[in-house]
């Protein structure tokens, strides 16, 4: 996104910043994006390599076991409950993820590799 | 909204300890940071450190680290900050607060701890 | 450790008018500032968090502005329950910090 040029007299009340995302590696100097109705700025940030190193994802969530598989979809799905997130990160209580259905032996193998992500 | 309830200020005597509870209540306590803020009488707002319930990562000011030990038990909903080797000046109100960076925090009501002979 | 400055010490004012309270970092804290309200015997209320993103159930006529070293709390009109100490604090990194404060008063 690039930087609009504010209009002259026009005041934006409240920016809503995304994450800092480093321009090499995990961490270290990188750019965060905000935007405020139609303006949006990029600003310089940095993401501290020992906070990286200690909390890994931004947000960790529980998940409950797969739904059954829908039909009218071809996909199930499952919901997580917000188990951790790094101090600064704006994480959603809840997330419901979704994925094809697919035989019982890829699901169970697709499946158990989801649930150490939690 | 989570609400947060103090106990176990008072009066202790220098080179005494204290165990501090923050009880929650509410929404899930959990999933949040829990802080520890002090403040002496008359005097601004100092972060003693911080302790996460679900697997009890701990960041302490370093001010502290010989001082302070953060706790949680999940079961009861309940934080601890146990203060040790306490002096005059740790005279203050101390006071939880449950943080999340989307929806803000929730403090305690805070608790007076008063050191003296 | 991050050194926050706040200024000015004490701000007196009158019912309705603007005020405008400052937070400077001895470096930058991108938008990790938030800004609390107190008042005596009470514990901190959280006016403001990431350096302009609103609370629910705080009044619209506080507003903050950032990101960098240096930081703004406006009261667009100051009303009577206004009157308390306001901190800034950053969560940049460890350890966390406070501004020093600056008490808003009736003129």
């Known amino acids: 996104k690039k930087k609009e040029k504010v209009k002259k007299g026009s005041e934006c009340s409240e920016w809503t910043w995304g994450p800092c995302t480093p321009s090499s590696k995990d961490c270290g100097m990188g750019f965060r994006e905000g935007t405020c109705g139609a303006q949006t700025q990029r600003v310089h940030c940095k993401v501290p390599c020992n906070w990286k190193k200690e909390f890994g994802a931004d947000c960790k969530y529980k998940f409950e076991s797969w739904g059954a598989c829908d039909g009218s979809t071809g996909t199930k799905a499952r919901q997580g409950t917000l188990k951790k997130a790094r101090y600064n990160a704006q994480c959603q209580e809840t997330i419901r993820v979704t994925k094809p259905c697919t035989s019982k032996t890829k699901s169970k193998t697709k499946a158990k590799k989801g649930k150490g992500k939690d | 909204q989570v609400q947060l309830v103090q106990s176990g200020g008072g009066l202790v005597q220098p080179g005494g300890s204290l165990r501090l509870s923050c009880a929650a209540s509410?929404?899930?306590?959990?999933?949040?940071?829990m802080n520890w803020v002090r403040q002496a009488p008359g005097q601004g707002l100092e972060w003693i450190g911080m302790i996460h319930p679900s697997d009890s990562e701990t960041i302490l000011n370093q001010k502290f680290k010989d001082k302070a030990t953060l706790t949680v038990d999940i079961s009861k909903n309940t934080a601890y900050l146990q203060m040790n080797s306490l002096r005059a000046e740790d005279t203050a109100v101390y006071y939880c607060?449950?943080?999340?960076?989307?929806?803000?925090?929730?403090w305690g009501q805070g608790t007076l701890v008063t050191v003296s002979s | 450790e991050i050194v926050l400055t706040q200024s000015p010490a004490t701000l007196s004012l009158s019912p309705g008018e603007r005020a405008t309270l400052s937070c400077r970092a001895s470096e930058s804290i991108s938008n990790n500032l938030h800004w609390y309200q107190q008042k005596p015997g009470q514990a901190p209320r959280l006016l403001i968090k990431y350096a302009s993103q609103s609370i629910s159930g705080i009044p619209a006529r506080f507003s903050g502005s950032g990101p960098g070293t240096d930081f703004t709390l406006t009261i667009s009109s100051v009303e009577p329950e206004d009157f308390a100490v306001y901190y800034c604090?950053?969560?940049?990194?460890?350890?966390?910090?406070f501004g020093g404060g600056t008490k808003l008063e009736i003129k």
């Open positions: 607060s449950s943080w999340s960076a989307k929806r803000g925090d929730f």
């Open positions: 604090q950053q969560s940049n990194s460890w350890p966390l910090t």
């Open positions: 509410g929404q899930s306590f959990s999933s949040y940071w």
